[in-house]
Interface confidence: medium
């Protein structure tokens, strides 16, 4: 019985040590954050500004409201959701899509007509920043004015109309080399992505004054790489599961391994009224032990450690992902600044 | 003599160990990078695409050229410059400046006239993205047309002219609440910043059909926060010295402390033709020993370690700053993707 009592005491002492250690870590982190904020804002001391002065100086105006409103919804801690920003996978910025064949786009002789574009599931309509159709116009022998029409194929209407215009433009071409011309098709693409069944293809016409078509729609000899294509710029903020993303603990956790703990920094509690928004934010901190292959930041860290004759101390518990906070503050010169302060929130802890 | 020989041998052996260790680290890093790239691009295996297929599919078009041309100048290693992007200090995005008093702007009765704006040295003319003057127009009782004039005070000209127009506009106001109106003053602000002596202030007039001025220039009772103000959006990419930024070593270095070593990854050497650009890139890796307070990533790490009963193994040599690479590649579906792959380059090593 004495043995189990001793074991219990050791366990209690261990928990108590862990508690004191975490308390210490919390305190250090808060003090460090205060120093960091002043230092990152290049301020020697906290601006001395009263609440009354703030009330008087703060414009009751749209741009300020917009900035402050961002903070009304308190930045949610990333540990709450099962999905978080994916900072591991590649973020797609530009997708270049070549035309493919389609049953809809057939000429009377059965040959395919240009152009039908299939879209990757990667492209979501609300993520499209820019979409350009690029067409190549063959060289001309004499100076000519070219009328370009980009038409969208639609289901035949009652009056027999099968097309609707996307864009038309006039180009003055000089003899010499052919030219690439881009046409904004963002709205059309977004419609297609919202209603894929409406994507029946497009028709490209680029007629000179004599009605000759200069657009390369199906490359002839020596015309490789001159097909029309779509250049789509997307914002890609992929999400991935928080699985394998590092442990999250709370103050009551008995976890001894490397873990992220919650820590809220309250500016009002320091009397920092000069910070207009946010009034508080979740900073978090890392604490805990690291085993060799536990929660390593890079997939190859364990390979390195296996072969490491001098690295036997092993990896340590450290922030593996940090994010900035946006801050609205008075700088003590009758100026309100809205800026971004890097690396103020611990998003993830790991052994690296 | 024997003693010094032994010492020399130990030293050689130490260097040799370090060499072997670094060789091992290099190898691990290259293998990890290959795995990372495929994994980050969500590819199970490297796309099987021939050089001929690439030649055929690759559009010979401006947007592709632009993307590829970025790689012609090989991304220079950040260790070469004495200044690098400052990822520590806050980046200013918006500065809101309230008017201050000026000797130039006096009415006949000696009361100050609105408005004179002093500018922070933080605002450089070539960093100004947007500058809006916001003015508040008091509510009207009946529908009215307001003619707004924003005038710039200048040194009196020969003909006595003291003003030049910045902007004039017509507003149709409905009864009810007052309105905030913004006016683009970017060009004026840039001129003031280039030639501060030309900043003598502005005058704001907003007259209704009866000649009443609706602009709040000096707030009356209940008009706190309705002053005119300037909202300036700036791009701020501060630089800071590489001092205290972590050590850089080369393969011949005898440095035992935590250091960044060069490592070039060559895709052509793996036969990865599906990567259009870059053909090679500088990845780098970290290696070396960590003492307690050497090169710590966060200013408070040493405080934490001092109080750490279980962290006595100390901090470890790990990337403290990583950057992405941009990549242009075929995804094997007739699509060319241009995207950003996070955390592929070690920019800085430190003990954390």
């Amino acid at each position: 019985n004495e043995g189990s009592e001793r074991e219990e005491n050791v366990e209690k002492e261990g928990l108590c040590n862990a508690c004191a250690w975490r308390q210490n870590t919390r305190y250090s982190r808060i003090e460090a954050i205060k120093i960091q904020i002043l230092s990152k804002l290049r301020l020697e001391t906290a601006p001395n500004i009263s609440k009354d002065a703030i009330r008087q100086l703060l414009p009751r105006a749209p741009p300020l409201r917009e900035l402050i409103d961002q903070y009304d919804v308190q930045r949610d801690d990333s540990s709450d959701g099962s999905l978080e920003d994916d900072d591991y996978h590649a973020t797609t910025e530009t997708i270049i899509t070549m035309p493919t064949e389609s049953d809809f786009l057939m000429q009377a002789d059965g040959k395919p007509k240009c152009c039908f574009f299939k879209f990757s599931s990667k492209i979501q309509y609300n993520k499209v920043v820019k979409a350009q159709l690029w067409i190549y116009l063959r060289p001309v022998k004499t100076p000519t004015t070219v009328f370009v029409q980009i038409l969208r194929l639609i289901k035949p209407m009652k009056d027999g109309t099968r097309y609707t215009g996307i864009r038309s433009l006039k180009l003055d071409m000089s003899p010499g080399t052919g030219i690439w011309q881009s046409i904004d098709v963002k709205t059309v693409l977004q419609n297609w992505l919202k209603q894929p069944e409406s994507n029946l293809g497009i028709e490209i016409k680029a007629l000179d004054e004599n009605g000759h078509d200069l657009a390369v729609t199906f490359p002839g000899p020596g015309e490789d790489g001159l097909n029309p294509f779509l250049e789509v710029k997307v914002t890609d903020t992929p999400k991935r599961s928080r699985r394998d993303f590092g442990l999250d603990c709370d103050e009551h956790s008995t976890e001894s391994r490397c873990c992220r703990y919650p820590l809220t920094v309250d500016f009002e509690a320091f009397g920092w009224d000069w910070i207009i928004a946010p009034k508080r934010y979740k900073a978090n901190y890392c604490s805990g032990e690291c085993e060799f292959v536990f929660l390593q930041k890079y997939p190859h860290t364990h390979l390195v450690h296996q072969a490491n004759p001098r690295g036997s101390a092993g990896p340590c518990c450290t922030p593996t992902k940090m994010s900035p906070i946006n801050m609205l503050y008075f700088n003590g010169k009758e100026q309100i600044i809205y800026g971004k302060i890097p690396a103020m929130v611990v998003d993830r802890c790991g052994c690296s | 003599n024997e003693g010094s020989e032994r010492e020399e041998n130990v030293e050689k052996e130490g260097l040799c160990n370090a060499c072997a260790w670094r060789q091992n680290t290099r190898y691990s890093r290259i293998e990890a990078i290959k795995i990372q790239i495929l994994s980050k691009l969500r590819l199970e295996t490297a796309p099987n695409i021939s050089k001929d297929a690439i030649r055929q599919l690759l559009p010979r078009a401006p947007p592709l050229r632009e993307l590829i041309d970025q790689y012609d100048v090989q991304r220079d290693d950040s260790s070469d410059g004495s200044l690098e992007d400052d990822d520590y200090h806050a980046t200013t995005e918006t500065i809101i400046t309230m008017p201050t008093e000026s000797d130039f702007l006096m009415q006949a009765d000696g009361k100050p006239k609105c408005c004179f704006f002093k500018f922070s040295s933080k605002i450089q003319y070539n960093k100004v993205v947007k500058a809006q003057l916001w003015i508040y127009l008091r509510p009207v009782k009946t529908p009215t047309t307001v003619f707004v004039q924003i005038l710039r005070l200048i040194k009196p000209m020969k003909d006595g002219t003291r003003y030049t127009g910045i902007r004039s506009l017509k507003l149709d106001m409905s009864p009810g609440t007052g309105i905030w109106q913004s006016i683009d003053v970017k060009t004026v602000l840039q001129n003031w910043l280039k030639q501060p002596e030309s900043n003598l202030g502005i005058e704001i007039k907003a007259l209704d059909e009866n000649g009443h001025d609706l602009a709040v220039t000096f707030p009356g009772p209940g008009e706190d926060g309705l002053n005119p103000f300037l909202e300036v959006k700036v791009t701020d990419t501060p630089k800071r010295s590489r001092r205290d930024f972590g050590l850089d070593c080369d393969e011949h270095s005898t440095e035992s402390r935590c250091c960044r070593y060069p490592l070039t990854v060559d895709f052509e050497a793996f036969g990865w033709d599906w990567i259009i650009a870059p053909k090679r890139y500088k990845a780098n890796y970290c290696s070396g020993e960590c003492e307690f307070v050497f090169l710590q990533k966060y200013p408070h790490t040493h405080l934490v370690h001092q109080a750490n009963p279980r962290g006595s193994a100390g901090p470890c040599c790990t990337p403290t700053k990583m950057s992405p690479i941009n990549m242009l590649y075929f995804n094997g579906k007739e699509q060319i993707i241009y995207g950003k792959i996070p955390a592929m380059v070690v920019d800085r090593c430190g003990c954390s």
């Epitope: 029409q149 027999g160 215009g165 | -």
Partner: antibody, heavy 119, light 106 residues
Framework: QVQLVQSGAEVKKPGASVKVSCKVS????????IHWVRQAPGKGLEWMGG????????IYAQKFQGRVTMTEDTSTDTAYMELSSLKSEDTAVYYC????????????WGQGTMVTVSS | DIQMTQSPSSVSASVGDRVTITCRAS??????LAWYQQKPGKAPKLLIY???DLLSGVPSRFSGSGSGTDFTLTISSLQPEDFANYYC????????FGGGTKVEIK
């Protein structure tokens, strides 16, 4: 070079209809938009409507809605404008004009067709 | 409907004079505005499109400016062959013409 050649002058009685033709030569008719503009003696230009030779779709000025019909015959590269229920105030020179696309200026004009409405 | 108001309705000028004709749209039409020249008994001829782009073959003494609602046609140095009627036309949605300006010899 693209040219628009219109049919000859017409004299019509009030209440009758008139059909003016506009033949396109020297270019691909199907790419053009043909608009119709009229000008009463001593007055300014008045837009009546247009037709896309490509799709056959039409757009009419509100003033002429229900009284004007614009058609095209791709086999002869000809556009037509028919105005019904003629009144004396319809006496004018009627021009056809080519637009490169629906929303565009008129870069090539026909020579005009004089239509006189008189009892 | 967007109305196009052209002024003046007539202008008397001499060879070498600078002549300015204005055209106002009742609503913003961006730069969807063309200017035409019409001589007696002839069809109109397009001079300027997109408010300021001179058609090829049109002398450089003609210039156009403006955007939104206010537009100007300027003849920098009037020549004998420039005496004619001038019309502005908006060509966004349903096209419509201004009332015209007669440039006559003083």
């Amino acid at each position: 070079q693209v040219q628009l050649v219109q049919s000859g002058a017409e004299v019509k009685k009030p209440g009758a209809s008139v059909k003016v033709s506009c033949k396109v030569s020297g270019g691909t008719f199907s790419t053009f938009h043909i608009h119709w503009v009229r000008q009463a003696p001593g007055k300014g230009l008045e837009w009546m409507g247009g037709i896309s030779a490509y799709s056959g779709s039409t757009i009419y000025a509100q003033k002429f809605q229900g009284r004007v019909t614009m058609t095209e015959d791709t086999s002869t590269d000809t556009a037509y404008m028919e105005l019904s229920s003629l009144k004396s105030e319809d006496t004018a020179v009627y021009y056809c004009a080519r637009a490169r696309y629906v929303d565009d200026a008129f870069d090539i004009w026909g020579q005009g067709t004089m239509v006189t409405v008189s009892s | 409907d967007i109305q196009m108001t052209q002024s003046p309705s007539s202008v008397s000028a001499s060879v070498g004079d600078r002549v300015t004709i204005t055209c106002r749209a009742s609503e913003d039409i961006s730069n969807f505005l063309a200017w035409y020249q019409q001589k007696p008994g002839k069809a109109p001829k397009l001079l300027i499109y997109a408010a300021s782009d001179l058609l090829s073959g049109v002398p450089s003494r003609f210039s156009g400016s403006g955007s939104g609602t206010d537009f100007t046609l300027t003849i920098s140095s009037l020549q004998p062959e420039d005496f004619a009627n001038y019309y502005c036309q908006k060509y966004i949605s349903a096209p419509s013409f201004g009332g015209g300006t007669k440039v006559e010899i003083k």
